[in-house]
């Protein structure tokens, strides 16, 4: 099939790399600069990513494949093969509409990137709270009050009040 | 299809701060640059500056001290303030919107109608 | 003084070819794709060729665009009466990091 294919069509014939040039009777011409082919049998060249302004270049463009961006310092990519660029913010923090904003009490975010998460509520898998959470880290559950034996651990359970780490309801 | 419009006062005092803002309509402000181009009377195209939806800057080296360019996603609006400015500042002020260096190749390709701002006491 | 260099003025009549050159560095037009604009007095620049060679959606065949090392020139052929306008070339340039631009030519169509 392919041996009948590029008798019928001799630009199956160009490699990755070059284009059917139908101006010049359908031979194989090397893309230009800034362009690329990455299959074979192509009658145009894609023009190159540049990788410009906020975004760098990871990987330079050549004629058979498309140049790779990735992000300045402080910010990373987002998006398919890092389409976008979004500022990077604090542990302990998230990016909203008017920029970095701290997570709000019961909420934390160990990334510079992505939204805060409400602390895991440890009661609902029937432990306790053994690090408090903060902006920045998730509460460490513990074993449950009753599975602690007389002298076995010196945590204290925490007051049946509030139980710090308990995300707000 | 996105548009863009340049708003501010046309006359500014010497010395003092230029301020204008592009609203952009028809489109989104996210994942692209938004640039400020100006044009002396008769004279070349100058690019002030631009900032990425998600806030990098960058300015021409001739202009850094005195130029801040903001953004403000949540209106789709960007900004631009140019200080301490002189006659020579006296231009007509393009905002743009500018697609090149994400998977765009086309560069600067919407432009506003532009705004003339005097510079003159 | 601009970064990239375009003569002033360039005229043709109706019918001929014209070509209008623009001339820049290593650093911008010799490392990066360059684009063109053409602008009517009192209205903004608009895209005419972009990454060297490629037209924008409803921008006719007879203008095209090229570039050899640090040099990039574009070419109207046809020429009619309303291609009269300021055409402008710009390039990205990296060690501004940013767009630098010509400063124009002046297409008179005689």
């Known amino acids: 099939f392919e041996r009948t294919r590029s008798l019928q069509d001799p630009c199956s014939n160009c490699p990755a790399g070059t284009f059917c040039d139908n101006n010049r009777n359908q031979i194989c011409s090397p893309c230009p600069p800034n362009s690329f082919s990455s299959a074979g049998g192509q009658r145009t060249c894609d023009i190159c990513r540049q990788c410009k302004g906020v975004f760098r270049t990871r990987k330079e463009c050549s004629s058979t494949s498309n140049a790779e961006c990735d992000c300045t310092p402080g910010f990373h990519c987002l998006g398919a093969g890092c389409s976008m660029c979004e500022q990077d913010c604090k542990q302990g923090q998230e990016l909203t509409k008017k920029g970095c904003k701290d997570c709000c009490f019961g909420t934390f975010n160990d990334q510079k990137r992505g939204i805060c998460r409400p602390w895991t509520n440890c009661s609902l898998d029937g432990k306790s709270v053994l690090v408090n959470g903060t902006k920045e880290r998730d509460v460490v559950c513990g074993p449950s009050p009753a599975d602690l034996s007389p002298g076995a651990s010196s945590v204290t359970p925490p007051a049946p009040a509030r139980e710090p780490g308990h995300s707000p309801q | 299809q996105v548009q863009l419009q340049e708003s501010g006062p046309g006359l500014v005092k010497p010395s003092e701060t230029l301020s204008l803002t592009c609203t952009v309509s028809g489109g989104s402000i996210s994942s692209y640059y938004w640039t400020w181009i100006r044009q002396p009377p008769g004279k070349c195209l100058e690019l002030v500056g631009y900032?990425?939806?998600?806030?990098?800057?960058s300015y021409n080296p001739s202009l850094k001290s005195r130029v801040t360019i903001s953004i403000d996603t949540s209106k789709n609006q960007f900004s631009l303030q140019l200080n301490s400015v002189t006659a020579a500042d006296t231009a007509v002020y393009f905002c743009?919107?500018?697609?090149?260096?994400?998977?765009?190749?086309?560069?600067?390709?919407?432009w506003g109608q532009g705004t003339t701002v005097t510079v003159s006491s | 003084q601009s970064v990239l260099t375009q003569p002033p003025s360039a005229s043709g009549t109706p019918g001929q070819r014209v070509t209008i050159s623009c001339s820049g560095s290593?650093?911008?037009?010799?490392?990066?794709?360059v684009n063109w604009y053409r602008q009517l007095p009192g209205t903004a620049p608009k895209l005419l060729i972009y990454?060297?060679?490629q037209r924008p959606s409803g921008v006719p065949d007879r203008f095209s665009g090229s570039k050899s090392g640090t040099s990039a020139s574009l070419a109207i052929s046809g020429l009619q009466s309303e291609d009269e306008a300021d055409y402008y070339c710009?390039?990205?340039?990296?060690?501004?990091?940013?767009?630098?631009f010509g400063c124009g030519t002046k297409l008179t169509v005689l």
């Open positions: 900032i990425y939806y998600s806030g990098y800057t």
């Open positions: 710009a390039a990205w340039d990296d060690s501004l990091n940013g767009w630098v």
């Open positions: 743009a919107r500018d697609d090149y260096g994400g998977n765009g190749y086309y560069g600067v390709d919407v």
């Open positions: 990454s060297n060679n």
């Open positions: 290593s650093s911008n037009i010799g490392n990066n794709p």
